[in-house]
Each structure stands twice: as structure tokens, then as C-alpha cells.
């Protein structure tokens, strides 16, 4: 049965579709396969820190080192990708900080997507000095294994020189790589010695070899592409939000809820209210009122703004987010002070998030 009673004819699932808006994400740490990664838990005054990955407790092992507020992953692999959290337990409360780890190279071969520095890779030779092809920037070719999330753009580079200027061609799994071999084809930027594939899918997995040759010789370099699959997940809410707040009577206040969701999220702001002088219905469930929800008539649903507040506005405000997979919620308290009392930012103690993975 539902864990609450709704008042004032509000419904949990409005009939109109939700509005699309920018979904915020936890901080993302990127590492290439084989690299080591060190993350510091960004929480203060932590007596005890515990770590989780994708909701499962994380303990030390031969590749994972937990020292104080630091998490170290040695020799990262794509399996280390996921949603991590550190929870700081204190004497009076606990707080959680979430971050993403991507063991990948989203734009591969250590280069920016727009090739701003690519021109220097196109080396012109004195016409008298005949020379077989050679690599001009091996640093950009060091990472051979590229694990990339589906739908990302991948770029492989083989910066080379030679005289006469070498030509470049690409092979996939040892065979000529043709445009029709993938949906959407691919781009080759000869001046930047690069192969670009947009919106990669799992069928793009494989070995990609650049062959650079002129009449004096031929060199080649092979990259391995792994496209990391994703599974549907329920919404993730940024820890610490919404934050407790206080204001004076007549003041304004904002609560913010940051949401991460691949699937379209539906956001609701809910408050505990009284009906006929009671906070609970005959069934013992609390009365709740939906103050705002994402929909066609709603502005940025991640923010709940309260203006000219009264003492009646004091209480707990719940940010509840659902998608077709599941839901999550976090809450904060509003304290309304008499006008003569100056407001101060309260210690931001957040209710435990409803992460139940």
C-alpha cells in the first residue's frame, strides 16, 4: 500500500508528459585502462568513511586500496567503471558524496575532439630528403586499448611524417574498413592523421589499424576498441541536496535537487501537511501535498522556490524523482524564524537517500 496519503487532489503521476531539461551528473573521473586512479572523498570532518560501487560495499583488494579519505584503483579496467559513493559517518549524522568513474577514453588517442593542435602533426619535408614513413607523435598513440561507452565519439590518431608525404588507410580486424561497414560511416581527417567514429555501438568493437605508407616504406599501428554497454538505471540524486535552509518570515528560499538519469525523469516536490489539524490520515499514513512537478506547465523542476514564506511553510520538503525503472528521494528541512532573528545557514544534514540497490 502507499506510504502516504495525498491531499488536495494531487496525483503522483500527472497525465501530461514531463518536460525535457538538462540532467545534472555526479562528478566524473576518467582513467584509461591500465592506469591508476586516486580519488579523494570530498567530505569534511569524517570520523569513518565507507565506500560503495554501484550500491555495493567496496572493500580493499589487490587492486583497490582504501586509505583514510582516499580511494586508489590500480591498473584500472572497464569493470571498474560505475557509480561510486563515499559516506562519512559522524557522531550526529552521515553524509554521502557520489561520483562516476569511467575507465575509458571518451575522445580517444589523447586529443581534443576539434583537433585544435592537429596541424603540427602534418610535417612537411625538404623535397630532397627522401624518407620512409615515421611516427611524429608517439605520445598520442600510447593508449592501445580504448573502452568507450556506447553512443560516444571515438577518435584514433596516427600522426606521421615522411617524404614523399605518406598516405594513410585504415583496417578493421585486418580488413579494409569501408564506410558501409558501420551505420553512419566514419570520417578520416588526413591532415590530422585521424579516424573518427561518432555514436559508437557494440558492433564497432574490434581492432583498428592505421597503415601509413609511401614508396620508401610502410608502418602501422593497431588500436583495440571496446564499446561498454549500459543497463537501465533508476534516478540518482546528488548527495547533500536538497540542503536544509532557514529564513525569516517574509523571506524567500530555494531548494535544489540535482538529478542524474538516462531515462526521462519525473520530479516532484512534496511536503508533509496537516488536514483537519492532523498530520496523519485514518490509516496512519502521513498527509503529503505535491507542490511542484515536472510537466508541460512547469519551469525548472530541479528547483523549488518559495517566496514570502510564513511559519506554516516550515517543515520537511521531499524531492522525489522517478523514471520507468524506479525512484529515489531525498529531503531537507526549512526553518522559518521570527523577523527579528537573522537567518543563518544551517548545518546541512540530509536525510538518507533512498538508494536501495
Amino acid at each position: 500500500r502507499p506510504s502516504f496519503s495525498l491531499v488536495e487532489d494531487t496525483t503522483l503521476e500527472p497525465e501530461e508528459p514531463p518536460t525535457k531539461y538538462q540532467i545534472s551528473q555526479p562528478e566524473v573521473y576518467v582513467a584509461a585502462p591500465g592506469e591508476s586512479l586516486e580519488v579523494r572523498c570530498l567530505l569534511k570532518d569524517a570520523a569513518v568513511i565507507s565506500w560503495t560501487k554501484d550500491g555495493v560495499h567496496l572493500g580493499p583488494n589487490n587492486r583497490t586500496v582504501l586509505i583514510g579519505e582516499y580511494l586508489q584503483i590500480k591498473g584500472a579496467t572497464p569493470r571498474d567503471s560505475g557509480l561510486y559513493a563515499c559516506t562519512a559517518s559522524r557522531t550526529v549524522d552521515s553524509e554521502t558524496w557520489y561520483f562516476m568513474v569511467n575507465v575509458t577514453d571518451a575522445i580517444s588517442s589523447g586529443d581534443d575532439e576539434d583537433d585544435t593542435d592537429g596541424a603540427e602533426d602534418f610535417v612537411s619535408e625538404n623535397s630532397n630528403n627522401k624518407r620512409a614513413p615515421y611516427w611524429t607523435n608517439t605520445e598520442k598513440m600510447e593508449k592501445r586499448l580504448h573502452a568507450v561507452p556506447a553512443a560516444n565519439t571515438v577518435k584514433f590518431r596516427c600522426p606521421a611524417g615522411g617524404n614523399p608525404m605518406p598516405t594513410m588507410r585504415w583496417l578493421k580486424n585486418g580488413k579494409e574498413f569501408k564506410q558501409e561497414h558501420r551505420i553512419g560511416g566514419y570520417k578520416v581527417r588526413n591532415q590530422h592523421w585521424s579516424l573518427i567514429m561518432e555514436s559508437v555501438v557494440p558492433s564497432d568493437k574490434g581492432n583498428y589499424t592505421c597503415v601509413v605508407e609511401n614508396e620508401y616504406g610502410s608502418i602501422n599501428h593497431t588500436y583495440h576498441l571496446d564499446v561498454v554497454e549500459r543497463s537501465p538505471h533508476r534516478p540518482i540524486l546528488q548527495a547533500g541536496l536538497p540542503a536544509n535552509a532557514s529564513t525569516v518570515v517574509g523571506g524567500d528560499v530555494e531548494f535544489v535537487c540535482k538529478v542524474y538519469s538516462d531515462a526521462q525523469p519525473h520530479i516532484q516536490w512534496i511536503k508533509h501537511v496537516e488536514k483537519n489539524g492532523s498530520k496523519y490520515g485514518p490509516d496512519g499514513l502521513p498527509y503529503l501535498k505535491v507542490l511542484k512537478h515536472s510537466g508541460i506547465n512547469s519551469s525548472n523542476a530541479e528547483v523549488l522556490a518559495l517566496f514570502n514564506v510564513t511559519e506554516a511553510d516550515a517543515g520537511e520538503y521531499i524531492c522525489k524523482v522517478s523514471n520507468y525503472i524506479g525512484q529515489a528521494n531525498q529531503s531537507a528541512w526549512l526553518t522559518v524564524l521570527p523577523k527579528q532573528q537573522a537567518p543563518g545557514r544551517e548545518k546541512e544534514i540530509t536525510a538518507s537517500p533512498d538508494y536501495l540497490e
Epitope: 500500500r1 506510504s3 549500459r230 533508476r234 525503472i325 525512484q327 540497490e357
Partner: antibody
């Protein structure tokens, strides 16, 4: 490995009610919505509604409000769907499916006949 | 409600062929579309979610694309075991509606 086991086929009289079950195993039952889907040759696949087991929140397709009632028993990781005032139009295969529609039950065949 | 329209109820193809099934939403659903395969007497099986993400364990030959109102599901090289009905579904807003299905026949 997640698994959804649905109750067996039902043959019921018009006007009666039926309650079918979907027992979940292999994952945290309370962490995912449980969806119910109706399938008939004429209408194809129709989403009936969903329930979030952790707090009992439900969401219904307007078409099935008053017809279907979704409940859960967290202690046994089982979701239930009750269909009331049955008519021949309710004869169908009913599926339960986990939140992301990534795991489905095998289906319960309901036949309404006098 | 958002209506999902699969224009072809039947499609005939040969083993090794490339086949594409289309689905049109009655309003913008961003990339909130899934594709399912259903074989006779079986439950639907998730192949693609969020328009282009292939679900775990699904063979590479299955792919999805599209955004907004127009979506495509592609089998790059049809196998005999791909004989089935394929459904699209929007998971943008409730009620989560399905397309009418496209039955793929192998010549």
C-alpha cells in the same frame, strides 16, 4: 540472475475477480518498479501500470484504472495484480516485468468464459 | 497518450540481409525508446533501450538509432533465429505505450 515466476493459467466466470502473482528472485525486489503488461492478438502489448515495492507507489494507465489493482508483499518479494468485474475483453496473457523491462515473467493466461 | 506507430506489420527478408524496422512517436520522446523481440509462446525480450543502447548479452547485429519522433531498429545480418515480432515502446512518460509490432518473416 533475476527471475520472475508468475502464477498459473486462470479460467474464470464473467463478473468474477482474479488475483495473479509474480514472485521475484535474484535481485533487490524493492529497488525496481514492477510493471504489468496485457497482451492480446487484437490490441497487442498494453501497459497496465507499475508499482514501486519500497513504498507501494502505483501508477496506472487510465484505461485500466478501476479494473486493475497492484499490490506487493515485500516479505516474499511478490507482486500481485487483481482484476475485477471480468469480461471476455479481459481474456489475455498478462506479464509482469522488472523496472527497466529487462526481465519478464513467463506470462499468466487468463480466460474469462461462462 | 503517446502513440507509437510501426508502419510495417510484416516484413520479409532473407538470411544474411540487412533489415530496418521503423517506429514513429506521436510526439517528441527524446531518446526514450526501447525495442523488444518476441518469439511465439515466449515473453518479450529487451534488445535496445534509450534508443541506441544494446542490452547486455544481445548480439552485435542488433542496433537502434533515432531521436525525437523517428526511430529505427536494424538487424545488420539477419539470422534464421531472428524470426519474431519486434515491438518499439516509449518510456518517456506514463502510460508507457508500445507499437503494434512488426513480424519478421524469413524467406
Amino acid at each position: 540472475q533475476p527471475y520472475l515466476q508468475q502464477s498459473g493459467a486462470e479460467l474464470v466466470r464473467p463478473g468474477a475477480s482474479v488475483k495473479m502473482s509474480c514472485k521475484a528472485s535474484g535481485y533487490t525486489f524493492t529497488s525496481y518498479n514492477m510493471h504489468w503488461v496485457k497482451q492480446t492478438p487484437r490490441q497487442g502489448l498494453e501497459w497496465i501500470g507499475a508499482i514501486f515495492p519500497e513504498n507501494g507507489d502505483t501508477s496506472y494507465n487510465q484505461k485500466f484504472k478501476g479494473k486493475a489493482t497492484l499490490t506487493v508483499d515485500k516479505s516474499s518479494s511478490t507482486a500481485y495484480m487483481q482484476l475485477s468485474s471480468l469480461t471476455s475483453e479481459d481474456s489475455a496473457v498478462y506479464f509482469c516485468a522488472r523496472g527497466g523491462f529487462d526481465y519478464w515473467g513467463q506470462g499468466t493466461t487468463l480466460t474469462v468464459s461462462s | 497518450d503517446i502513440v507509437m506507430t510501426q508502419s510495417h506489420k510484416f516484413m520479409s527478408t532473407s538470411v544474411g540481409d540487412r533489415v530496418s524496422i521503423t517506429c514513429k512517436a506521436s510526439q517528441d520522446v527524446s531518446t526514450n525508446v526501447a525495442w523488444y523481440q518476441q518469439k511465439p509462446g515466449q515473453s518479450p525480450k529487451l534488445l535496445i533501450f534509450s534508443a541506441s543502447y544494446r542490452y547486455t548479452g544481445v548480439p552485435d547485429r542488433f542496433a537502434g538509432s533515432g531521436s525525437g519522433t523517428d526511430f529505427t531498429f536494424t538487424i545488420s545480418s539477419v539470422q534464421a533465429e531472428d524470426l519474431a515480432v519486434y515491438y518499439c515502446q516509449q518510456h518517456y512518460s506514463s502510460p508507457y505505450t508500445f507499437g503494434g509490432g512488426t513480424k519478421l518473416d524469413i524467406k
